[in-house]
């Protein structure tokens, strides 16, 4: 027989997901001026663009680039200058050093004298000329220019102990998710950092095997739950004249300096105007600070009339992070994202005080994110369109107006293709770019400020379009359901040939940490979608209470109890899923990785018979082997005073008992900086005691995100076996 | 200054209608969300129902919820509260009041419109 | 619902004397409490809100104290204008219903 024209199209292999086959780009200008963008070719030059008059030229050479092996490149403001950066050697989550040369544009050759040292741990030039501040070995030194000797500003620095200008484990992963704590003034005449003292910080110490004879031992500073904490002050240098004053320390607020406390970030207003943010360590109370430079004093004075404080009564302040404020031209007013009176997150305008804050948007939806304010609009991103949450699109408000009138920029550009957009402005917004993450295949385009129209189409992913056009992809849908009173919003994918009167074998895919999202509207070729492509199984991924945009009163349920409602939740769709008659009860899976882990091992450990089999990647077991920052934010102290009992309660390990019916495979890398392997080990530790059988896998030398190609495949390779196993899938 | 100046008042019998008007001034009206809270003769403050001021989400305490309708004009700068199918027990001052922007606190007040409801 | 009781319903002060007012909540309130006047006649006045925050023109005479389920106004010296009703209102969720406690009656002795 022969197949018909239809047939033709061939089933993802798990091949094609390991080898990336059909991985998609974006395209995000680096902006440097209002009509002026630099970008990467394929070809790895660095083309300078002007949208205005259309001239495109090669401002850096790929051989200049491969002629250091430079990956990443900085223009100078003054455009006389271009760091190029090699040797790029990964630390934590967002934390590198890497070798940096500089480049004269001038000279088309590279400075030579003074040349920096390495590795270095960050580097940035000032908003304005070719300052150069970077951090070597825990300080901070400042170029006046990148041919001049470099000035040391810090000398406090000291591995493992004082870090000035960089984050420490913790600040860095839970609390500013940067590389750097340093910021220019907008003049570029005053540098901001902040110093972290990890002194009496509790040491994770853990092997690293390598090839040696006898393994390493990495020891990080890591305040697990209730432990000591980071100390952090603010100081700020006048880089002018660095050697005159010194460093200046900025005040902490009374109202928080009166108990242990976070600096959250820090936000330049104007050249002499700087506002920071603090955070109590019970994180419900936020303070933000706007303090001014007093020439006299050669201070920085921050009164208690600019403090503005944020508070949640039913949860935690701020979303993941409390909020950073986008001020106006005034340098004294500004826009703010926070929960309204109904518990949405909504845009809000501080003229004086934030009793009298003017609420810019609202709604049973939420405002997530304001890109940019300029003389007359705000832009923002918010899931309000059609009521689904796990979309975004652009919204541009005219502050001019009163009331202020509001545009959606985005919602019917390519409404089935697009309906995840994040967006990239130039410094007044004259232009931006458009990513959109799907549902449809990404695309980037380019438009005008004024008047949103599309200029040009930065990239629209046509090879990978073409490359699928013989793929047999599943179908996704997005959907909600009902339970008592609460909504659920889920994806589910659905193998290619699905018909509704067959059985499928379900497998729930779990993150469900709180402010997480999971059912968003974006294009992926992954894992899961070749399970549902290539194995016929039906994936669905449902937000349960506790992740985000969706308000408080759903944000907050899990707060001060994680590891109750998330896993209820993700039992209630189990079933709902089941009612819908195409799901063979016999067959349901979950798996999840970290937060997903945790709740994938709980909901395995419900003792509700609903799973066959379920697998747990670097899961946390217990909230008090986490970091402070996180496990606190959540359910307060592991103390008899406050909340040690949840902490008990919560853990994988008091469930032990309640694996014995069901199949479980426990993986994780033993150089896992962030859940460290302490976590699977007492899971494996307690499953010993109780006697109960399980499976598991750890990957030797490798952090978090199991990410190296080897250990990558062998790890989705094995998760497959057990999957298809379990499933009674034949190979 | 903050002023609201409530009217409307007067005397109904049990089932009929009647609508309670507040004209507001002082403030940017359309910012800030407003409230109708009530006083029986010789009795305590009770909370009747609430408009946000952006977004218009109404709210009404159990007592009136399905007879009352809450509702604002911003153009007019008035807030309103439409009654029907009063009941005796309806009989009170009537204020109209300003929330605060961040909290449901009342920061100004009207000086109020009586409401009799009787056979 | 979170009910709020004030005590006493009636309290007989002379000008001069210091008067203290309770309200205790059902629940836990935070510190999310305001305090009103209402004089004989007249429309309730805001005095403190957030448990301790005077409101705008209030005199330093009026103070507020208290968190989570029992709160108190203080009037230290007692004014011949200050003889009225004074009631305490939650707001602890800003989703209604607020409440407001049954009052208490400050009079001339």
């Known amino acids: 027989l022969r197949p018909s024209r239809g047939n033709t199209k061939r089933a993802l292999t798990l091949k094609d997901i390991l080898n990336g086959t059909f991985s998609y780009k974006t395209y995000f200008p680096n902006w440097i001026s209002e009509q002026e963008y630099l970008h990467q070719s394929e070809d790895d030059n660095i083309v300078f663009y002007n949208i205005e008059t259309r001239e495109s030229y090669i401002i850096l050479s790929n051989s200049t680039m491969k002629s250091v092996n430079a990956t990443d490149y900085g223009l100078s403001p003054d455009r006389q200058f271009v760091y190029l950066e090699s040797d790029y050697s990964k630390l934590w989550r967002y934390s590198y050093t890497a070798t940096y040369y500089i480049y004269d544009l001038q000279n088309g050759e590279f400075v030579r004298g003074y040349e920096l040292p390495r590795p270095i741990q960050y580097l940035c030039w000032s908003p304005v000329g070719s300052k150069l501040a970077y951090v070597y070995q825990n300080n901070i030194y400042l170029k006046q220019r990148p041919g001049d000797p470099p000035f040391q500003i810090t000398y406090t620095g000291r591995e493992n102990r004082i870090f000035n200008g960089i984050p420490d484990w913790v600040y860095e992963e839970e609390m500013l998710a940067t590389k750097y704590a340093l910021w220019w003034s907008p003049d570029g005449k005053f540098l901001a950092y902040v110093e972290f003292n990890d002194s009496d910080i509790p040491i994770i110490a853990y092997s690293y095997y390598g090839d040696g004879q006898y393994p390493r031992t990495i020891n990080i500073p890591y305040p697990k739950a209730g432990a000591k904490n980071p100390v952090v002050r603010v100081f700020i240098v006048d880089t002018t004249y660095p050697h005159h004053v010194g460093p200046m320390e900025v005040p902490v607020p009374e109202m928080i300096a009166s108990s242990d406390y976070y600096f959250s970030w820090l936000t330049w207003v104007s050249s002499e105007r700087v506002c920071l943010q603090w955070l109590k360590r019970v994180q419900n109370v936020s303070v933000l600070s706007i303090c001014d430079f007093r020439e006299d004093w050669h201070a920085w004075e921050c009164p208690k009339n600019q403090e503005h404080v944020e508070e949640s009564r039913t949860g935690w302040a701020g979303g993941f992070f409390v909020s950073t404020p986008a001020f106006s031209q005034d340098a004294t007013s500004y826009y703010k994202i926070f929960s309204d009176k109904d518990g949405y997150k909504h845009i809000h305008y501080i003229k004086d005080t934030v009793e009298n804050a003017i609420q810019i948007t609202s709604g049973k939806w939420e405002a997530i994110y304001i890109f940019r304010v300029t003389q007359d609009s705000l832009f923002y991103s918010s899931n309000e369109f059609e009521g689904y949450p796990g979309r975004r699109n652009i919204y541009r408000i005219s502050i001019g107006n009163s009331p202020p009138s509001k545009k959606c920029v985005t919602c019917h550009l390519r409404k089935e293709r697009c309906q995840y957009y994040t967006a990239s402005f130039s410094y007044k917004a004259k232009y931006y770019a458009l990513v959109c993450y799907g549902p449809g295949l990404p695309i980037s385009t380019l438009h005008d400020g004024r008047t949103d129209q599309e200029i040009q189409v930065l990239e629209e992913n046509k090879e990978l379009e073409n490359s699928l056009r013989n793929i047999q992809l599943p179908k996704v849908e997005i959907k909600k359901l009902k339970d008592g009173g609460l909504t659920f919003w889920y994806k589910m994918i659905l193998p290619p040939q699905f018909d509704r009167s067959k059985k499928y074998p379900l497998l729930i895919q779990v993150y469900g940490g709180p402010c997480s999202q999971s059912v968003k509207s974006v294009f992926a070729v992954n894992w899961i979608t070749y399970l549902a492509s290539k194995e016929g199984i039906v994936i669905a991924l449902v937000d349960g209470r506790g992740t985000a945009f969706q308000g408080d009163k759903f944000l907050h349920a899990v707060y001060r109890k994680l590891g109750v409602y998330e896993v209820e939740d993700q039992l209630t769709a189990v079933r709902k899923f089941i009612e819908m008659g195409f799901i063979d009860e016999e067959r349901i899976a979950i798996w999840g990785w970290s937060y997903g882990g945790y709740v994938s091992s709980l909901a395995l450990a419900s003792g509700t018979g609903l799973f066959k089999c379920g697998i747990a990647v670097a899961p946390v077991s217990s909230w008090e082997y986490y970091a402070s920052i996180y496990s606190e934010r959540f359910m307060g102290l592991p103390t008899k005073d406050d909340n040690l009992e949840h902490y008990k309660n919560s853990t994988v390990m008091a469930r032990a008992e309640y694996f014995r019916n069901v199949d479980y495979l426990l993986i994780h890398g033993t150089a896992d900086d962030n859940v460290h392997f302490q976590n699977s080990a007492q899971i494996a530790k307690a499953l010993v005691n109780a006697q109960v059988d399980f499976q598991a896998m750890w990957y030797s030398d490798q952090n978090h995100g199991i990410s190296s190609g080897r250990s990558q495949n062998h790890l989705y390779t094995h998760m497959t076996h057990f999957l298809k196993q379990c499933f009674s899938l034949s190979d | 200054d903050v002023q609201l100046v409530e009217s409307g008042g007067g005397v109904v019998r049990p089932g009929e209608s009647l609508t309670l008007s507040c004209a507001a001034s002082g403030f940017t009206f359309s910012n800030y969300d407003m409230g109708w809270v009530r006083q029986a003769p010789g009795e305590g403050l009770e909370w009747v129902s609430g408009i946000r001021g952006r977004g218009g989400s109404t709210y009404y305490a159990d007592s009136v919820k399905g007879r009352f309708t809450i509702s604002r004009d911003s153009s007019k700068n008035t807030l309103y509260l439409q009654m029907n199918s009063l009941r005796a027990e309806d009989t009170a001052v009537y204020y109209c009041a300003k929330e605060n922007n961040r909290h449901s606190f009342f920061e100004y007040w009207g000086l109020g419109t009586l409401v009799t409801v009787s056979s | 619902e979170i009910v709020l009781t004030q005590s006493p319903g009636t309290l007989s002060l002379s000008p001069g004397e210091r008067a203290t007012l309770s309200c205790r909540a059902s629940q836990s309130v935070g510190h999310y409490l305001a305090w009103y006047q209402q004089k004989p006649g007249q429309a309730p006045r805001l005095l403190i809100y957030?448990?301790?925050n005077r409101a705008i023109d209030i005199p330093d005479r009026f103070s507020g104290s208290g968190s989570g389920t029992e709160f108190t106004l203080t009037i230290s010296r007692l004014e011949p204008e200050d003889f009225a009703v004074y009631y305490c209102?939650?707001?602890?969720?800003?989703?209604?219903?607020?409440?407001f406690g049954g009052g208490t009656k400050v009079e001339i002795k």
């Open positions: 209102q939650q707001y602890y969720n800003n989703w209604p219903p607020l409440t």
């Open positions: 957030d448990a301790s």
